[in-house]
Interface confidence: medium
């Protein structure tokens, strides 16, 4: 049994707040029509609401978000040679979070 | 296009490292046979490796982990009254990460 490793500390709730998450920049965000390219970087950090609330009827939701455009490199492969282009991807960062009732519509500013 | 909101900064790669994530403590982790109870807290923070690597043949993987037992409250509902018990859940924290080739076997300490 693994229980003997250390004394069990009381578990602390992961409160509803913004945390750093990894967002994968999929190629479809850059170009839906062509798959013959790479994106750099393949992933970036975003701020997202996570954690849990006091009961199942409420969820951790963003109350304020911000759109953040970032520039990525689109590396097209043409006749086995790389051609470097630039593209813009708009990321969504969560700025503030709140435990909200599941069915409630929420204004996002 | 949203590019006019602000100037697009160059995207920075989300490097392979430990980040704080939220781990859901599901009831089945506590008791397989009985669904007539609640777990508190319903979720906790863990440290997990995330981020991306230079190419698709490598993945961000933990190289060192720690198993951490935590004590949760199992709140049984008996004749509409709550009975408080304790249970232990073993969490896994990642302590160190590395970009490793996908198929490589890896020792974990």
């Amino acid at each position: 049994s693994l229980g003997s490793l250390t004394i069990a500390e009381p578990a602390m709730i992961a409160e509803c707040k913004t945390r750093t998450e990894v967002f994968e920049i999929s190629r479809r965000l850059i170009d839906r029509t062509n798959a013959n390219f790479l994106v750099w970087p393949p992933c970036v950090e975003v701020q997202r609401c996570s954690g849990c609330c006091n009961n199942r009827n409420v969820q951790c939701r963003p109350t304020q978000v911000q759109l953040r455009p970032v520039q990525v490199r689109k590396i097209e492969i043409v006749r086995k040679k790389p051609i470097f282009k630039k593209a813009t991807v708009t990321l969504e960062d969560h700025l503030a979070c709140k435990c909200e009732t599941v069915a409630a519509a929420r204004p996002v500013t | 296009s949203l590019g006019s909101l602000t100037i697009a900064e160059p995207a920075m790669i989300a490097e392979c490292k430990t980040r704080t994530e939220v781990f859901e403590i599901s009831r089945r982790l506590i008791d397989r046979t009985n669904a007539n109870f609640l777990v508190w807290p319903p979720c906790v923070e863990v440290q997990r490796c995330s981020g991306c690597c230079n190419n698709r043949n490598v993945q961000c993987r933990p190289t060192q982990v720690q198993l951490r037992p935590v004590q949760v409250r199992k709140i049984e509902i008996v004749r509409k009254k709550p009975i408080f018990k304790k249970a232990t859940v073993t969490l896994e924290d990642h302590l160190a990460c590395k970009c490793e080739t996908v198929a490589a076997a890896r020792p974990v300490t």
């Epitope: 049994s1 693994l2 229980g3 | 781990f23 859901e24 403590i25 599901s26 089945r28 982790l29 397989r32 863990v46 997990r48 490796c49 993987r61 933990p62 060192q64 982990v65 198993l67 232990t88 859940v89 073993t90 969490l91 896994e92 924290d93 990642h94 890896r106 974990v108």
Partner: antibody, heavy 120, light 107 residues
């Protein structure tokens, strides 16, 4: 409803490689340890490997150690088994199974399995 | 490695019979013993865990007992749907090991 669906099996020559996948749904995949168990035709059950919920702790049967690698992608709710240097005795139906918590090395729910045949 | 020995390897019984299957571990495994049922062409199903705890949704005619090295699975009154192969498994230590199985057939 818990669902585990394996894929990637097939016929492979001795010494060859194969990668099995197990797509999970109906439960919080990232909260559970997962395993691979195999069953040779007409034989009993044999544990192959187990991986922790976060992917950092792995364990293997001696018969596959150094040849097989278990991994998972929690963002895709998928479990993998990379099988290298395959041998005739690896021929079996490979099933993924949900293994409960860290102190619980058992198998709550199973997939239907995918057949791996190693033959020249 | 811990060896798990099941007996008998097969048995014939009738509907309504009381059936007992035994499983012996080569060393003490406390109560870390689980029982599974497998029907032909189907995935195994967990019946009993921790030697005597009934898995959710499993009929109460199935029961488990024992600790240390000797364990028993009992079906109090065999039903038509119970004809299958039963496996024990120790979850005390890796490598995890199964018994060889007991096939319960119709008499």
């Amino acid at each position: 409803e818990v669902q585990l669906v394996e894929s990637g099996g097939g016929l492979v020559q001795p010494g060859g490689s194969l990668r099995l996948s197990c797509a999970a749904s109906g439960f919080t995949f990232s909260s559970y340890w997962m395993s691979w168990v195999r069953q040779a035709p007409g034989k009993g059950l044999e544990w192959v490997s187990t991986i922790s919920d976060g992917g950092g702790t792995t364990s293997y049967a001696d018969s596959v150690k150094g040849r097989f690698t278990i991994s998972r992608d929690n963002s895709k709710n998928t479990l993998y088994l990379q099988m290298n240097s395959l041998r005739a005795e690896d021929t079996a139906v490979y099933s993924c199974a949900e293994s409960g918590g860290a102190t619980d090395y058992l198998f709550d729910y199973w997939g239907q399995g995918t057949l791996v045949t190693v033959s020249s | 490695d811990i060896q798990m020995t099941q007996s008998p390897s097969s048995l014939s019984a009738s509907v309504g019979d009381r059936v007992t299957i035994t499983c012996r571990a080569s060393q003490s495994i406390s109560s870390y013993l689980n029982w599974y049922q497998q029907k032909p062409g189907k995935a195994p199903k967990l019946l009993i865990y921790a030697a005597s705890s009934l898995q959710s949704g499993v009929p109460s005619r199935f029961s488990g007992s024992g600790s240390g090295t000797d364990f028993t699975l009992t079906i109090s009154s065999l039903q038509p749907e119970d004809f299958a192969t039963y496996y024990c498994q120790q979850s005390y230590i890796t490598p995890l090991t199964f018994g060889g199985g007991t096939k319960v057939e119709i008499k």
